[in-house]
Amino acid sequence: EPPTACREKQYLINSQCCSLCQPGQKLVSDCTEFTETECLPCSESEFLDTWNRETRCHQHKYCDPNLGLQVQQKGTSETDTICTCEEGLHCTSESCESCVPHRSCLPGFGVKQIATGVSDTICEPCPVGFFSNVSSAFEKCRPWTSCETKDLVVQQAGTNKTDVVCGPQDRQR
């Protein structure tokens, strides 16, 4: 009786279970009653990353330097090339097909998480007691100066964009 299901790493064809091709190899011909599945290695710069019955290998991704891309992991017969972005840039999508510059956090906002090759800068508003007076992709919100520790008093209140201004204490006669 012909099988209706096959074991792992096999596939059903012509009422017969044939072995799948291993990663890094493509299918040339299905097995028969008398012959094994015929597989062939993928060509250089091509890959297949699963046990398969594909007749064509996939092309390695190209990390195009003109798009700001660079290689993170070289492709092999079993794995695709993994791209990332050059310094100062990050991927526009999960598949990392192009790169854009990291955004800066505007005054009043600080960097919560510095950008990487695959993620943009994450900014956060400076809470009370903190400020940022620059547009930066690296600087966190900084705490207001503590006038008291310098034996000074607050002459001008701080904001999320400006530090407090300290001044001498008024001497009472």
């Epitope: 990663p23 890094g24 290695p41 993928c42 060509s43 250089e44 710069s45 091509e46 990353d49 092309q59 390695h60 190209y62 990390c63 660079q70 290689v71 993170q72 992991q73 070289k74 492709g75 092999t76 017969s77 079993e78 794995t79 695709d80």
Partner: antibody
């Protein structure tokens, strides 16, 4: 028998140009990626450039980017390295080497051709 | 770029004795997809081009004597010659085959004591 034979090396002045060739035989050239690697006199190995089997993928070392161009002609079983704006620090023995689609390593190296950049 | 650091710079070993050299990479050479470490060793004899010795950290190239063995994973790798022969006098280079730019260690020169 796998053979890789380079030519085109020689003495050139700073700012000058040179084109290296690597003739391949004994294997199906169009099935292999190819690299150029150089070795300054008495020094270690430095990777220069790579081109995939079908010409689709090309990578360069930062030290040569914008000055060197790797190319190949599969019909002629030949690999090339066009070197422009040459500098004294480009003086080296230049090797072509092939990369197969299994190991993804440089499995055969040519004998090398010497490039000397000097005024 | 991945920096490859080899030690020692040179090694003098008696014939028939063991020679061991180290290679460290500044980041992991483990391919996450197939779990292979893409660390390659090349041998360069005086006046000759380099020759592929070992790939994937520990797989000997066809024709390479079994006295040569490679080991390690991630960032720490070792090449061992179990019983040094006169024809093993050479410089041995480890190479990052994991990512571009491909980078080489500075080499370990093996001599006979």
């Amino acid at each position: 028998e796998v053979q890789l034979v380079e030519s085109g090396g020689g003495l050139v002045k700073p700012g000058g140009s040179l084109r290296l060739s690597c003739a391949a035989s004994g294997f199906t050239f169009s099935d292999y990626g190819m690299h150029w690697v150089r070795q300054a006199p008495g020094k270690g190995l430095e990777w220069v450039a790579y081109i995939s089997s079908g010409n689709r993928i090309i990578y360069y070392a930062d030290t040569v980017k914008g000055r060197f161009t790797i190319s190949r002609d599969n019909a002629k079983n030949s690999l090339y390295l066009q070197m422009n704006s040459l500098r004294a620090e480009d003086t080296a023995l230049y090797y072509c080497a092939r990369q197969d689609g299994y190991r993804y390593a440089m499995d055969y190296w040519a004998q090398g051709t010497l490039v000397t950049v000097s005024s | 770029d991945i920096v490859m650091t080899q030690s020692p710079d040179s090694l003098a070993v008696s014939l028939g004795e063991r020679a061991t050299m180290s290679c460290k990479s500044s980041q992991s050479l483990l391919n996450s997809g197939n779990q292979k470490n893409y660390l390659t060793w090349h041998q360069q004899k005086p006046g000759q081009p380099p020759k592929l010795l070992i790939y994937w950290t520990s797989t000997r190239e066809s024709g390479v004597p079994d006295r040569f063995s490679g080991s390690g994973s991630g960032t720490d790798f070792t090449l061992t010659i179990s019983s040094l022969q006169a024809e093993d006098v050479a410089v041995y280079y480890c190479q990052n085959d994991y990512t571009y730019p491909l980078t080489f260690g500075g080499g370990t020169k093996v001599e006979i004591k």
